[in-house]
């Protein structure tokens, strides 16, 4: 999955009069990240995590930039001709992505009363619109307004593409990646194998993404590959994964063995439980 930054900017009109407020919701890698109105931006969650993202900076720049965008969108809404009585909304959704091969994509989408009527690929500058006559009318309306000052518009949308990517890179550089990662629950069990030996099994479950390192160590040193048996990494039905690794050891030497787990940059070690044998079964065929 690419890293992404998604801005959802909403302005409102009531009985044809454009309201002064606006709301921007920002998602980083698909997770709620920042919510801004015309007065301030607020991170989600606040606290230690937000401090990690920002360092010693504040959200002042974001607030200033998004306030400017809010004004632009209010002007756009004011130029939509078919405003009827009651409440109406204009949304601009802007998305930029950085893919694993470092290629980038940016797009912009306009919605009126929740209905998509105009999209632009911000790299190719290509516009697309749905086939409905209402969407076509709205799209022509907005495009004509945006073309009124063609140079400003061109500069504005180039800047939007560049700024979005620059912001995304800045947030990612902070080391706070919101891409979904769920650490595993790790559970070690022991079972009787044969006289004087026990099989110890280390199970990791509920983790995402699927890449994981799970292995047995003796006195802190990894056991050779052929003395361990691995289960496949399998989906568990909850959008996460599970796997296991087992090895056979001499009874009485349990305290020398630990299960080592590494996942998404985090690692942990898990001892063999002491005491009676818990499960009377063998993983070895």
């Amino acid at each position: 999955e690419p890293h992404s930054l998604r801005y959802n900017l909403t302005v409102l009109s009531w009985d044809g009069s454009v309201q002064s407020g606006f709301l921007t919701e920002v998602h980083l890698d698909g997770q709620p990240f920042l919510r801004c109105d015309r007065q301030k931006c607020r991170a989600k969650p606040q606290g230690q995590w937000a401090e990690d993202v920002l360092g010693n900076k504040t959200w002042d720049r974001e607030t200033r930039d998004l306030t400017g965008n809010g004004k632009d969108l209010r002007m756009t809404l004011a130029h939509i001709k078919d405003q009827k009585e009651g409440l109406h909304s204009l949304q601009e959704i802007r998305v930029c992505e950085i893919h694993e091969d470092n290629s980038t994509r940016s797009s912009q989408h306009f919605y009126y009363d929740g209905e998509l009527f105009l999209s632009q690929n911000l790299e190719t500058k290509e516009w697309t619109m749905p086939q409905s006559s209402r969407a076509q009318t709205l799209a022509m309306n907005v495009r004509n307004f945006l073309k009124e000052d063609a140079m400003k518009t061109k500069t504005h949308y180039h800047a939007m593409h560049a700024d979005c990517l620059q912001e995304l890179r800045r947030y990612l550089k902070s080391g706070v990646v919101l891409r979904r990662t769920v650490p595993p629950m790790v559970n070690v069990t022991r079972s009787e194998a044969s006289e004087g030996n026990i099989t110890v099994t280390c199970r990791a479950s509920g983790f995402y993404p699927w890449n994981i390192t799970l292995s047995w160590r003796q006195d802190g040193v990894s056991l050779s590959h052929d003395t361990q048996q691995w289960g496949d990494v399998l989906p568990d039905g909850n959008g996460t994964y599970q796997t296991w690794v087992a090895t056979r050891i001499c009874q009485g030497e349990e305290q020398r063995f630990t299960c080592y787990m590494e996942h998404s940059g985090n690692h942990s070690t898990h001892p063999v439980p002491s005491g009676k044998v818990l499960v009377l079964q063998s993983h070895w065929q």
Epitope: E25, Q31, P32, R35, D37, Q39, K40, R42, K44, P45, Q46, G47, Q48, W49, D52, V176, V177, L178, R179, R180, T181, V182, P183, G206, S264, G265, N266
Partner: antibody
Framework: QVQLQQSGPGLVKPSQTLSLTCAIS??????????WNWIRQSPSRGLEWLGR?????????DYAVSVKSRITINPDTSTNQFSLQLNSVTPDDTAVYYC??????????????WGQGTMVTVSS | DIQLTQSPSSLSASVGDRVTITCQAS??????LNWYQQKPGKAPKLLIY???NLETGVPPRFSGSGSGTAFTFTISSLQPEDFATYYC?????????FGPGTKVDIK
């Protein structure tokens, strides 16, 4: 559905450590859209937020300044629970302690699921 | 810390009455406010989030409004099960803070 089950002693001696555990079912302590909180309630202080733990690519904690020097909230992914430790307690820490989840709503930091509460008395 | 004050601190009402509680914040908190109901010996229960959004499963007789520093919580027609204490809570800034509560009892 999501449930929180609290456990821990109801009586703690002054200067000792208050320890409570909150077991989660129906959700994961390492969900990266939730935060796991401790809140207490007493007649003198009302409802008082103490702190939280949450996972966003790594583990974070936020604590109320009033208890920051004495509090630790730890997640335990192997048992899917989280714990509260409050050191050097005084009778002023006598309260009903609640664990609570925050995170069902995309933007609102609302405590939508609560534990049953544990009355903790600090007395010798 | 952001202070929240509630008024009244208690009120007596009858079944069917319209009940209004206000919550005042010590600074602008936009719409970052929730309302809870608590019955004796029980944990608080979320009723309203983001100042005006009804939590799933909560009856529509409960409503909330306001933004900035002034907020209102309303029960349009009080039912026997609504006699309880109601709290507002802000999440604009850490630490999360709660109002002192408003106790609604039977007249």
């Amino acid at each position: 559905q999501v449930q929180l089950q609290q456990s821990g002693p109801g009586l703690v001696k002054p200067s000792q450590t208050l320890s409570l555990t909150c077991a989660i079912s129906g959700d994961s302590v390492s969900s990266n859209s939730a935060a796991w909180n401790w809140i207490r309630q007493s007649p003198s202080r009302g409802l008082e937020w103490l702190g939280r733990t949450y996972y966003r690519s790594k583990w974070y904690n936020d604590y109320a300044v009033s208890v920051k020097s004495r509090i630790t909230i730890n997640p335990d992914t192997s048992t899917n629970q989280f714990s509260l430790q409050l050191n050097s307690v005084t009778p002023d820490d006598t309260a009903v302690y609640y664990c609570a989840r925050e995170g069902a709503h995309e933007w609102a930091d609302a405590f939508d699921i609560w534990g049953q509460g544990t009355m903790v008395t600090v007395s010798s | 810390d952001i202070q929240l004050t509630q008024s009244p601190s208690s009120l007596s009402a009858s079944v069917g009455d319209r009940v209004t509680i206000t919550c005042q914040a010590s600074q602008d908190i936009s719409n970052y406010l929730n309302w809870y109901q608590q019955k004796p010996g029980k944990a608080p229960k979320l009723l309203i989030y983001d100042a005006s959004n009804l939590e799933t499963g909560v009856p529509p007789r409960f409503s909330g409004s306001g933004s900035g520093t002034a907020f209102t919580f309303t029960i349009s027609s009080l039912q026997p099960e609504d006699f309880a204490t109601y709290y507002c809570q802000q999440y604009d800034n850490l630490p999360h803070t709660f109002g002192p509560g408003t106790k609604v009892d039977i007249k």
